[in-house]
């Protein structure tokens, strides 16, 4: 059985302040079951940006229908980007457990924020 991969196709994305940023992520398998989470940064201080399973993330919208049973597209759209949103974003697959166990991370996508055009 082929090992699950998490693919973030863009190494970097540049967005003007005030616009929306799309961060792409796909998984190559639905197995093992478990949620996808998005983080900014790495290590214990990383910031949770989106959790497929729970939480309120008012600026984050899944690009694809997250309730599809065969969904393997975990791309997200972040609205109203500001310079404070700059950083590297990681799409991370977890295996179910108590607690869920981190299984595989994408390579990361660096978001840079351009000044709003005058």
């Amino acid at each position: 059985e082929e090992e699950l991969q998490v693919i973030q196709p863009e190494k970097s994305v540049s967005v003007a302040a005030g616009e929306s940023a799309t961060l792409n992520c796909t998984a190559t398998s639905l197995i093992p079951v478990g949620p996808i989470q998005w983080f900014r940064g790495v290590g214990p201080g990383r910031e949770l940006i989106y959790h497929q399973k729970e939480g309120h993330f008012p600026r984050v919208t899944p690009v694809s229908d997250p309730t599809k049973r065969n969904n393997m597209d975990f791309s997200i759209r972040i609205s109203n980007i500001t310079p404070a949103d700059a950083g590297t974003y990681y799409c991370v697959k977890f295996r179910k457990g108590s607690p869920d166990v981190e299984l595989k991370s994408g390579a990361g996508t660096e978001l840079s924020v351009r000044a709003k055009p005058s």
């Epitope: 639905l30 729970e54 599809k68 049973r69």
Partner: antibody, heavy 117, light 107 residues
Framework: DVQLVESGGGVVRPGESLRLSCAVS????????MSWVRQAPGKGLEWVSG???????YYVDSVKGRFTISRDNSKNTLYLQVNSLTAEDTAIYYC???????????WGLGTLVTVSS | ALTQPASVSANLGETVKITCSGG??????YGWYQQKSPGSAPVTVI????ERPSDIPSRFSGSASGSTATLTITGVRVEDEAIYYC???????????FGAGTTLTVL
């Protein structure tokens, strides 16, 4: 409070059709996948069909081609069109809200479908 | 197919465990559904293996390991008498399945 209220059941003859409805309230219907689960008299629960928030559909093999699940997000209503009914389809039909991983957290009271000649 | 015992009994206040086997933990999530009488609306007591809805008492808990899911009721009460169905979502077939149900009798 989350509420799911089924309707549309009744007594029909083999080969006939019905349209079951499930009116929901108390949550944002358009954000949740939904399912129909049935229970034949004296039997256990059987998942029948599911639908994603965007309208992708899934069926148990025994009803494929005969049953059609649909939803109207503007009316907060889930539907199940049941055609070519047989005695084996006699059951209480429950609608259920799906969790993020396609289990069920809330159920309706059910509507009874009886197929009899 | 999910396999669970047809019936279990426990004395009032005891801890009772109901098992459900036959799934693969890597591709399945499990839930437990309580039905007080045949034909009455099911009530979810556990979903996502071990998560409990906010209105379900803390004496209900769930776990899953390998091919077996377990529902545990700690300090069972008379009102817990019911049929308990385990259910699973299979991420490899996109289908839901249920066990045949376990009738819990409180003595």
């Amino acid at each position: 409070d989350v509420q799911l209220v089924e309707s549309g059941g009744g007594v029909v003859r083999p080969g006939e059709s019905l349209r079951l409805s499930c009116a929901v309230s108390g949550f944002r219907f358009s954000s949740h996948a939904m399912s129909w689960v049935r229970q034949a008299p004296g039997k256990g629960l059987e998942w029948v069909s599911g639908i994603s928030s965007g309208g992708d559909t899934y069926y148990v093999d025994s009803v494929k081609g005969r049953f059609t699940i649909s939803r109207d997000n503007s009316k907060n209503t889930l539907y199940l069109q049941v055609n070519s009914l047989t005695a084996e389809d006699t059951a209480i039909y429950y609608c259920a809200r799906e969790t993020w991983n396609h289990l069920f957290d809330y159920w309706g009271l059910g509507t009874l479908v009886t197929v009899s000649s | 197919a999910l396999t669970q015992p047809a019936s279990v009994s426990a004395n009032l206040g005891e801890t009772v465990k109901i098992t459900c086997s036959g799934g693969d933990s890597s591709s399945h999530y499990y839930g437990w559904y309580q039905q007080k009488s045949p034909g009455s609306a099911p009530v979810t007591v556990i979903y996502s293996d071990d998560e409990r809805p906010s209105d379900i008492p803390s004496r209900f808990s769930g776990s899953a390991s390998g091919s077996t899911a377990t529902l545990t009721i700690t300090g069972v009460r008379v009102e817990d008498e019911a049929i308990y169905y385990c259910g699973a979502y299979d991420g490899s077939t996109y289908a839901n399945t249920f066990g045949a149900g376990t009738t819990l009798t409180v003595l």
